[in-house]
């Protein structure tokens, strides 16, 4: 009798014993993973974070499509809505090079860097070349008309812009567009002035920054964040809150991200720091993420959301502020009138797209998303979709705006820039990190419930034994 | 080194004509327009005529319009104005100055035009 | 046309004093303001055109302010060849308009 009873408490402790490992493992497993990410999300040489962060292991691409306006001569002498048709898209490689002057400082425990730009064609991903033609805003016109709203100073624009046989708009190749082309009429400015134009000018041989984040070794909680940028923690753009420089550069977020969290990034593209909420979770390539949008409340106006009320930088374009959607950026572009907003005016009020026709907004194409894998914090896919527009208005002292009746906000382009972690990089994301930490909660569960039910089978039959040995 | 010289100042009745003459150095007037201004003795400066930039534009003084006329003849590099049914009150030192954005960086020397009988 | 009243039309100052002249445009003009200075028998010379930009060559003691309607040149601290007549003038619409002058005479 007792070799059984005694092999069935034995049962019953191993089975308690497995269970009680099983639940120790459960804090001490999270805390092994937690001083696991804690270390390799740390912004220093050795880490997996610091080697992917100097120099992405995804391809990143950015596909343009161009607003070929349809109707330039309609527009320009009856000031009738602009006709645009979207072609593309074009795709350039984007972001392959490595950061650049990476410094330390252990006083701050920050680490700078220069973020290099450069772009190459990839003809195969794109519809056209390089060397397609495009009817689009005369973007020198336009903006030195904003630029010189001085009656006198407008009459010499004129003659300028007449004797280069400029005009509203112009013919211009992509690469030209983008890229950068010496313009006929600023050309004839006998000062020297900048007389290359282009969407994009300069940008191959030029970098971003210099950045400043925090490298997280004196707390993970701040890894990737911004200190400052270009020297600075503000912008000098916007007035209050509006002008602070928040969070990271969307690349990476601190690790342990909560869905209820509000991620903060700073976009030096749309000279702001925004924000996304999570949406949904998502399965990419078997690493479970979650996925953050940027809601239509961020491009609000201050009367739908009082917190974009420093975002309204001027009450004419706006409406009083009471138009939203769109972005005017011309303090950060030196003057000249550029308005960012999301492709096809997505989330924009009609006022602002009732002058262009052509226009077809669809949240899933033009919204901007970023997956995030919430253990690590590091952005495993992204979409950042925007649309660079122009303002032109009327001026009776330039021939070439003389009959327009109306202010336009002139979609030039929109981008979709897309990354997307690589089959081999999620493999590895999957044995390093998802794979241990399953295998990690599956042992867990496995201990747990074997323990569980181990001592609850033995402790069953010991008291049936004991029972009937009693009677 | 960019000079202005005018010249073409002189006596000349009332109702008479005259023609004045800038001509520049140092830099093409057809890039910049040039001004006329001019000082009556012991008066303040008052502005007269203009010709924009690749001469795309003349405008006037209310005082001067419809008898004064500017011109420009860019291969001399010359710019003129030409002066008729002159008055009294037209008698002072006019000088041609280069202009792009509006204010005055060069200036002549001047030219005395004196309206007498 | 847009009328530039400039004051004081004189003022006696001496050598190392501070001299401010004003002038009032009669609308708004943004910052397209110039400043003369004219010496007896010579042309005018530029000191400053956007209202605060100070022309190449021009002694830094030379400044000016303003923008709108209301604008000011300010000597720092007067020397013997700064005695002469200021002018302004805007640039901001034909005609283009000049002060009336202020003449800037030892004491």
């Known amino acids: 009798g007792c070799d059984r009873n005694c092999g069935l408490i034995t049962g019953a402790v191993i089975g308690a014993v497995l269970a009680v490992f099983g639940g120790i493992l459960m804090p001490v497993g999270d805390m092994l993973i937690q001083k696991t990410i804690k270390k390799e999300v740390v912004l220093e040489e050795g880490t997996i974070a610091f080697k992917n962060w100097v120099k992405t292991g995804t391809e990143i691409y950015r596909q343009f499509w161009i607003f070929d306006v349809q109707n330039p001569q309609e527009v320009m002498m009856n000031s009738s809505n602009i006709q645009v048709k979207q072609r593309g898209p074009y795709t350039y490689r984007v972001r392959f090079l490595a950061k650049e002057n990476i410094t330390q400082d252990p006083k701050d425990n920050t680490v700078s860097f220069l973020q290099p730009n450069g772009a190459i064609f990839e003809p195969s991903l794109s519809v056209g070349t390089e060397a397609d033609n495009f009817t689009v805003l005369n973007l020198a016109v336009a903006a030195a008309s904003h630029i010189y709203p001085n009656p006198f100073v407008q009459v010499v624009l004129n003659s300028l812009i007449n004797k280069s046989k400029s005009s509203m708009f112009q013919v211009r190749t992509l690469r030209e567009l983008l890229w950068g082309y010496t313009d006929p009429f600023l050309s004839l400015v006998p000062y020297p002035v900048s007389t290359r134009v282009g969407m994009f000018y300069p940008y191959n041989n030029t970098a971003d920054g210099v950045y400043k984040v925090f490298n997280g070794k004196d707390s993970i909680s701040k890894v990737a964040i911004i200190d400052t940028y270009k020297g600075k923690r503000n912008l000098s753009y916007w007035e209050s809150y509006c002008d602070m420089i928040n969070g990271t550069d969307a690349a990476s977020f601190p690790p342990f991200v909560e869905k209820s969290q509000v991620l903060q990034f700073f976009s030096s593209d749309i000279c702001r720091s925004i924000y996304a909420v999570f949406e949904s979770d998502v399965n990419l390539k078997g690493i479970p993420v979650y996925r953050f949008v940027l809601p239509s409340k961020a491009f609000a106006s201050p009367v739908q959301n009082p917190d974009n009320h420093c975002f309204c930088t001027e009450k004419i374009i706006s409406k009083n502020c009471t138009s939203y959607g769109v972005l005017d950026i011309s303090k950060c572009k030196e003057g000249k009138p550029v308005y960012i907003s999301l492709p096809h005016f997505l989330y924009a009020s009609p006022d602002v797209s009732e002058t262009i026709d052509g226009l077809n907004p669809n949240e899933e194409e033009h919204r901007t998303y970023l997956d995030i894998e919430p253990i690590t914090g590091f952005t495993l896919q992204f979409a950042k979709r925007l649309q660079v527009n122009l303002l032109v208005k009327p001026s009776n002292k330039i021939q070439v705006l003389k009959r327009l009746k109306r202010n336009y906000i002139v979609p030039i382009l929109w981008l979709n820039e897309t990354g997307t972690i690589g089959d081999e990089k999620a493999k590895m994301f999957r044995s390093q990190v998802t794979g241990k930490i399953n295998l990690l909660g599956l042992i867990e569960m496995i201990l747990l419930s074997v323990g569980v039910v181990m001592f609850v089978a033995f402790m069953i039959s010991y008291c049936a034994c004991r029972s009937k040995t009693i009677k | 080194e960019v000079q202005l010289v005018e010249s073409g100042g002189g006596l000349v009745q009332p109702g008479g004509s005259l023609r004045l003459s800038c001509a520049a150095s140092?830099?093409?007037?057809?890039?910049?327009?040039i001004h006329w201004v001019r000082q009556a003795p012991g008066k303040g400066l008052e502005w007269v005529a203009w010709i924009a930039p690749y001469g795309g534009y003349t405008y006037y003084a209310d005082s001067v319009k419809g008898r004064f006329t500017i011109s420009a003849d860019t291969s001399k590099n010359t710019a003129y104005l030409q002066m008729n049914s002159l008055r009294a009150e037209d008698t002072a030192v006019y000088y041609c100055?280069?202009?792009?954005?509006?204010?005055?960086?060069?200036w002549g020397q001047g030219t005395l035009v004196t309206v007498s009988s | 046309d847009i009328q530039m009243t400039q004051s004081p039309s004189s003022l006696s100052a001496s050598v190392g004093d501070r001299v401010t002249i004003t002038c009032r445009a009669s609308?708004?003009?943004?910052?397209?303001v110039a400043w003369y200075q004219q010496k007896p028998g010579k042309a005018p010379k530029l000191l400053i055109s956007?209202?605060?930009s100070l022309y190449s060559g021009v002694p830094s003691r030379f400044s000016g302010s303003g923008s709108g309607t209301d604008f000011t040149l300010t000597i720092s601290s007067l020397q013997p060849e700064d005695f002469a007549t200021y002018y302004c003038?805007?640039?901001?619409?034909?005609?283009?308009?000049f002060g009336q002058g202020t003449k800037v005479e030892i004491k």
């Open positions: 140092g830099f093409t007037i057809d890039a910049f327009g």
């Open positions: 003038q805007q640039h901001s619409n034909a005609p283009l308009t």
């Open positions: 956007y209202a605060t």
């Open positions: 609308q708004d003009v943004s910052n397209w």
């Open positions: 100055a280069r202009s792009f954005f509006g204010y005055f960086d060069y």
